[in-house]
Interface confidence: medium
């Protein structure tokens, strides 16, 4: 159920496992389900009471090169009259994903898995009120 | 990471594309960093479109545990704390990359897999279809 740290024996190795140098793993970056598409409700980023914009970040030494990040448009939330209500807060919702980072060291290249935090969208929350004594 | 020597013409032979298969270090960068304190939040309870979190477990995947959001209501919570069905709670979905053991059960051989997760919910104005 888990990926061990370096040096942990994980599964009894089936015969078909490829040989891998110690401290490393073989990673096929041909993505399974590559063509799967998100079937989110239409343009929820604009229809939300906590609307957001998208920014595409691009890095040629990262796989995938494109990562889309959301930013909340407002501090408050949009009320029924279409006005910003600052008694409520628009806050980002975040999710971790994995990327592969390519690193150049002189005339050599190495690859490292990296955990990246992606802001996916925003939600409207009641603020936490801190009462001053 | 595992260093791969480049060919002798190195400075001019930069390959812009990633190879199909790479050897990567077992240690994941940022594995245990709490990158943003806002991530560890109670938004799921305080949202006007609150959600529950369900544990999705798969021993052949890394990470093996993923928490999936499910919106609690069809509508949104209004100022009085009641569900308002003139608005809709909808899931915010995101494609994320995970590692899948390939071949199955192999200790150090993986393939990237794209999976769709519901991360949370947001309150939206419904799309009204006018009948002609």
């Amino acid at each position: 159920r888990k990926i061990p740290k370096v040096g942990h024996t994980f599964f009894q190795k089936p015969e078909s496992c490829p040989p891998v140098p110690g401290g490393s793993m073989k990673l096929d970056i041909g993505i399974i389900n590559e063509n799967q598409r998100v079937s989110m409700s239409r343009n929820i980023e604009s229809r939300s009471t906590s609307p957001w914009n998208y920014t595409v970040t691009w890095d040629p030494n990262r796989y995938p090169s494109e990562v889309v990040q959301a930013q909340c448009r407002n501090l408050g939330c949009i009320n029924a009259q279409g006005k910003e209500d600052i008694s409520m807060n628009s806050v980002p919702i975040q999710q971790e994903t994995l990327v592969v980072r390519r690193k150049h060291q002189g005339c050599s290249v190495s690859f490292q898995l990296e955990k990246v935090l992606v802001t996916v969208g925003c939600t409207c929350v009641t603020p936490v009120i801190h009462h001053v004594q | 990471g595992i260093t791969i020597p480049r060919n002798p013409g190195c400075p001019n032979s930069e390959d812009k594309n990633f190879p199909r298969t790479v050897m990567v270090n077992l240690n994941i960068h940022n594995r245990n960093t709490n990158t943003n304190p806002k991530r560890s939040s109670d938004y799921y309870n305080r949202s006007t479109s609150p959600w529950n979190l369900h544990r999705n477990e798969d021993p052949e995947r890394y990470p093996s545990v993923i928490w999936e959001a499910k919106c609690r209501h069809l509508g949104c919570i209004n100022a009085d704390g009641n569900v308002d069905y003139h608005m809709n709670s909808v899931p915010i979905q995101q494609e994320i990359l995970v590692l899948r053991r390939e071949p199955p059960h192999c200790p150090n051989s993986f393939r990237l897999e794209k999976i769709l997760v519901s991360v949370g919910c947001t309150c939206v104005t419904p799309i009204v279809h006018h009948v002609a």
Partner: antibody, heavy 119, light 107 residues
């Protein structure tokens, strides 16, 4: 160093509820799951459920779904387990344990809380 | 749920003896098995994870092995301070389950 400090022994009446606590120190509380375990002389150790303090997510052993409610307070780095409609069957030692989500194993346990349900 | 059957329930040994405890899972749990030591009045301590991986700081007289359904925990040379209850746990899939424990007593 990592510590899970559990609340003291409880003696409660049948039908009542009790809230046990597990205070974490020595690490970032939001990063790792807290699991709860019940120990009785007759049935041994039984897994109750898990809470992820970072996202509030919970999952329960079906046997304890209507008995236990898991919560966490990030401001005090404390996980809680509330046990309701108590009977003598709930008399046990209850442990919290930390699960290293990315490394993938349980490492630290609390010292346990003894709950006695008796009239 | 997965049943972990641990044997024996009791062991009475002399210092210097070799001790073996087994845990049998009712279905394959790969090697997602941990072994713990529980001394009276203390928290349980992790000794072995991933069936055979000795946890940080654990003396090398404690070893574990196994894969699938059959797991073994060994203390190569028992010492007086090893008096405790030892138990296994599978965390392959929830609900996570435990062996019944083995009480180790020193003559």
């Amino acid at each position: 160093q990592v510590q899970l400090q559990q609340s003291g022994a409880e003696l409660v009446r049948p039908g009542a509820s009790v809230k046990l606590s597990c205070k974490a120190s020595g690490y970032t509380f939001s990063d790792y799951e807290i699991h709860w375990v019940k120990q009785t002389p007759v049935h041994g150790l039984a897994w109750i459920g898990v809470i992820h303090p970072g996202n509030g997510g919970t999952a329960y052993n079906q046997k304890f779904k209507d008995k236990a409610t898991l919560t966490a307070d990030k401001s005090s780095s404390t996980a809680y387990m509330e046990l309701s409609s108590l009977t003598s069957e709930d008399s046990a030692v209850y442990y919290c344990e930390r699960f290293l989500t990315y490394e993938g194993y349980f490492d630290y346990w609390g010292q346990g809380t003894t709950l006695t349900v008796s009239s | 749920s997965i049943v972990m059957t641990q044997t024996p329930k009791f062991l009475l040994v002399s210092a210097g003896d070799r001790v073996t405890i087994t845990c049998k899972a009712s279905q394959s749990v790969n090697n997602d098995v941990a072994w713990y030591q529980h001394k009276p009045g203390q928290s349980p301590k992790l000794l072995i994870n991933y069936a055979s991986n000795r946890y940080t700081g654990v003396p090398d007289r404690f070893t574990g092995s196994g894969y699938g359904t059959d797991f073994t925990f060994t203390i190569s040379t028992v010492q007086a301070e090893d008096l405790a209850i030892y138990f296994c746990q599978q965390d392959y899939g929830s609900p996570y389950t435990f062996g019944g424990g083995t009480k180790l007593e020193i003559k």
